[in-house]
Interface confidence: low
Amino acid sequence: EVPQLTDLSFVDITDSSIGLRWTPLNSSTIIGYRITVVAAGEGIPIFEDFVDSSVGYYTVTGLEPGIDYDISVITLINGGESAPTTLTQQT
């Protein structure tokens, strides 16, 4: 079972960006996190990126004002990944 983030939160929300913060998981098997952004109701990710396992923050930029976004963070290990931790936020 790949460990899943439990404390994902939003910080520094503007009309075109959303900041994410979480506590990096303490496991030597984790190689990083994948951030996926979906415009609510669309199903297709409009943005994806990776950060390393020691990182606990990320700022998603280039968003459109007034739109709901589902933002997921997925824990990555070699050969697998966790279920997504997802939050919804409007810019």
Epitope: G79, G80, A83
Partner: antibody, heavy 116, light 110 residues
């Protein structure tokens, strides 16, 4: 209409270099991660490399790490793959593709042949 | 050796339904739902048919459908037509990178 057009393929000797380009149009290029995927003759698909929308992060398959470099110029809507120290096993059709978790648009491919 | 296993070939007659399976290992390769399917005709670029793992891009026939259960994803093609004859690849994630199945050659008989 989304279009991806690769160029730069050709015949090169082992140990040589090539630079592939992929010209993108019909979408906001700077908003999307981009990838290179290759297919050796008669074989299946193999992911090669990907680059984040801004170009700040890149990842490579183990088979090309240290030899290939992916880059992009968002002002020119163009994706690149610099291939050095080419080997016979790099012979393949190289496709650029949009996104990185899955690939919703593909170019027509450009053939790279590594042979002496 | 791919981390995703597909049958090398399947066949069916026009009008029939066929299913192509794609099995992952036990490491949670499908956990986040990132499973996609591509169709490739000879000499052509792959085309996305199914993603995430049951959604169909616009322009793809509703004869194509995807499903996922545990460590196995499936592509079903109903009402098989001659133009469906092609290679089909599944694709998911293995840690940081995309991984493809070895491909399945679909032959439409007759």
């Amino acid at each position: 209409e989304v279009q991806l057009l690769e160029s730069g393929g050709g015949l090169v000797q082992p140990g040589g270099s090539l630079r592939l380009s992929c010209a993108a149009s019909g979408f906001t290029f700077s908003s999307y991660a981009m990838s290179w995927v290759r297919q050796a003759p008669g074989k299946g698909l193999e992911w090669v490399s990907r680059i984040s929308p801004s170009g700040s992060s890149t990842y490579y398959a183990d088979s090309v790490k240290g030899r290939f470099t992916i880059s992009r110029d968002n002002s020119k809507n163009t994706l690149y793959l610099q291939m050095n120290s080419l080997r016979a096993e790099d012979t393949a059709v190289y496709y650029c593709a949009r996104r990185m978790s899955y690939f919703d648009y593909w170019g027509q491919g450009t053939l790279v042949t590594v042979s002496s | 050796q791919s981390a995703l296993t597909q049958p090398a070939s399947v066949s069916g007659s026009p009008g029939q339904s066929i299913t192509i399976s794609c099995s992952g290992d036990s490491l949670g390769i499908f956990r986040s739902g990132m499973v996609s399917w591509y169709q490739q005709h000879p000499g052509k670029a792959p085309k996305l048919m199914i993603y995430l793992p049951t959604s169909r891009p616009s322009g793809v026939s509703n004869r194509f459908s995807g499903s996922k259960s545990g460590n196995t994803a499936s592509l079903t093609i109903s009402g098989l037509q001659a133009e469906d004859e092609a290679d089909y690849y599944c694709q998911s994630w293995d840690g940081r990178q995309p991984v493809f199945g070895g491909g399945t050659k679909l032959t439409v008989l007759g």
